[in-house]
Amino acid sequence: GITIPRNPGCPNSEDKNFPRTVMVNLNIHNRNTNTNPKRSSDYYNRSTSPWNLHRNEDPERYPSVIWEAKCRHLGCINADGNVDYHMNSVPIQQEILVLRREPPHCPNSFRLEKILVSVGCTCVTPIVHHVA
Amino acid sequence: GITIPRNPGCPNSEDKNFPRTVMVNLNIHNRNTNTNPKRSSDYYNRSTSPWNLHRNEDPERYPSVIWEAKCRHLGCINADGNVDYHMNSVPIQQEILVLRREPPHCPNSFRLEKILVSVGCTCVTPIVHHVA
């Protein structure tokens, strides 16, 4: 493979904590410019496994506000608009990266943290356990 | 009250880029210790709006691998196992934070970036537009 020369403008990597402590520019580049206008914002109501969004707020974290999905029903909504308990509403979870302020009281020092969030719900066929 | 002095280990805030350039410790703290064992890993097959997971890889990004969900059908799977086109399979999207190496090829310098990822799919009632 091609060896890419180290950019001379790179921060110093002689630091004893390197490569575990890095510099991060927080001027966020948002790649979501051509976001589909039919975005998922109304799916939580129209889904056969509808969900509510709950706010999880923590000023010592970035992003400080995360929206957590909670499925409204154990079952799924059928064609008649009733809950069908032969199917299950389940949360779709994803592991995301957040920045945690650390040490405390340092406004510009963070630690990377992984948290599991429920993004929405989907309707699944249940796993049926037959008793012998 | 007790005055907590600014932690002497805090990075320098006199930097002209502060507070937009921060120090981040990459020793990830994982808060997902009590992850539900009945996790969403098999939901992609059991859902009435099943999806496939596609690998999105970028060595200049952290995390370098992100899994993107693509709904298998336009419609949803009905009780007979057939695709019902009166309902729609739609992706549930979430905005996530990633770290992008910047300047390129600097191992310890990053920029925060927001990207939109599809985490899974859900089955929704379609919005019907009636023509006058």
Epitope: R39, L53, E57, P59, P63, S64, H105, P107 | -
Partner: antibody
Framework: EVQLVESGGGLVQPGGSLRLSCAAS?????????MCWVRQAPGKGLEWIGC?????????DYASWARGRFTISRDNSKNTVYLQMNSLRAEDTAVYYC?????????????WGQGTLVTVSS | DIQMTQSPSSLSASVGDRVTITCQAS??????LAWYQQKPGKAPKLLIY???TLASGVPSRFSGSGSGTDFTLTISSLQPEDFATYYC????????????FGGGTKLTV
């Protein structure tokens, strides 16, 4: 230039209603921001009214005294936030400021408008 | 709601003086406190956030300290442009978010 410009203030009779607008420029409403209203009665201190999330989830917070009579809304396509004030009283006479909270640090207001004066009097 | 008590409500000082303004919260607010400066007819201007972090472009003669319930804003050597009203502001979150302001301290010559 990043700025907030309030409008819609003026004289209103007690019991009346008024809608204030705050137009943002130099940045776009998104999941990075919360847009807030703060007021200041003549010769008095600052008083927080409430905030609205600028992302694609509808969520608001209000000061306990403001809940019910004051409603904050937004139009992301116009990059504008509104404050609907009903059943106005003389003590609501104040300069009303629009302020922004950056999602990077939600503990303070990082940008303020110049304010618009609302006078409630018969 | 958390009450923010600021003192003194007014203060006379001279150019070059060292000035201290205090703010007390009715319950602990960690270090989630900001200080603003406001001049007549103008909007407030952020000076300090997270109790002790200087906002961008603010002169280093301004400093903040404290955590929990007791906080202090200090101006080490008063300049003519510093005569204004100062407000402390807290952030708090329980079931919903709230912000509160102190009553203000008017600094005059």
């Amino acid at each position: 230039e990043v700025q907030l410009v309030e409008s819609g203030g003026g004289l209103v009779q007690p019991g009346g209603s008024l809608r204030l607008s705050c137009a943002a420029s130099g940045f776009s409403f998104s999941s990075d921001y919360w847009m807030c209203w703060v007021r200041q009665a003549p010769g008095k201190g600052l008083e927080w009214i409430g905030c609205i999330y600028a992302g694609d989830v509808d969520d608001t917070d209000y000061a306990s005294w403001a809940r019910g009579r004051f409603t904050i809304s937004r139009d992301n396509s116009k990059n504008t936030v509104y404050l609907q004030m009903n059943s106005l009283r003389a003590e609501d006479t104040a300069v009303y400021y629009c302020a922004r909270v950056d999602g990077f640090d939600i503990t303070y207001f990082d940008l303020w408008g110049q304010g618009t004066l609302v006078t409630v009097s018969s | 709601d958390i009450q923010m008590t600021q003192s003194p409500s007014s203060l006379s000082a001279s150019v070059g003086d060292r000035v201290t303004i205090t703010c007390q919260a009715s319950q602990t607010i960690n270090y989630w406190l900001a200080w603003y400066q406001q001049k007549p007819g103008k909007a407030p201007k952020l000076l300090i956030y997270r109790a002790s972090t200087l906002a961008s472009g603010v002169p280093s003669r301004f400093s903040g300290s404290g955590s929990g319930t007791d906080f202090t804003l200090t101006i080490s050597s008063l300049q003519p442009e510093d005569f204004a009203t100062y407000y402390c502001q807290n952030y708090y979150y329980s079931t919903s978010r709230s912000y509160g302001f102190g009553g203000g301290t008017k600094l005059t010559v």
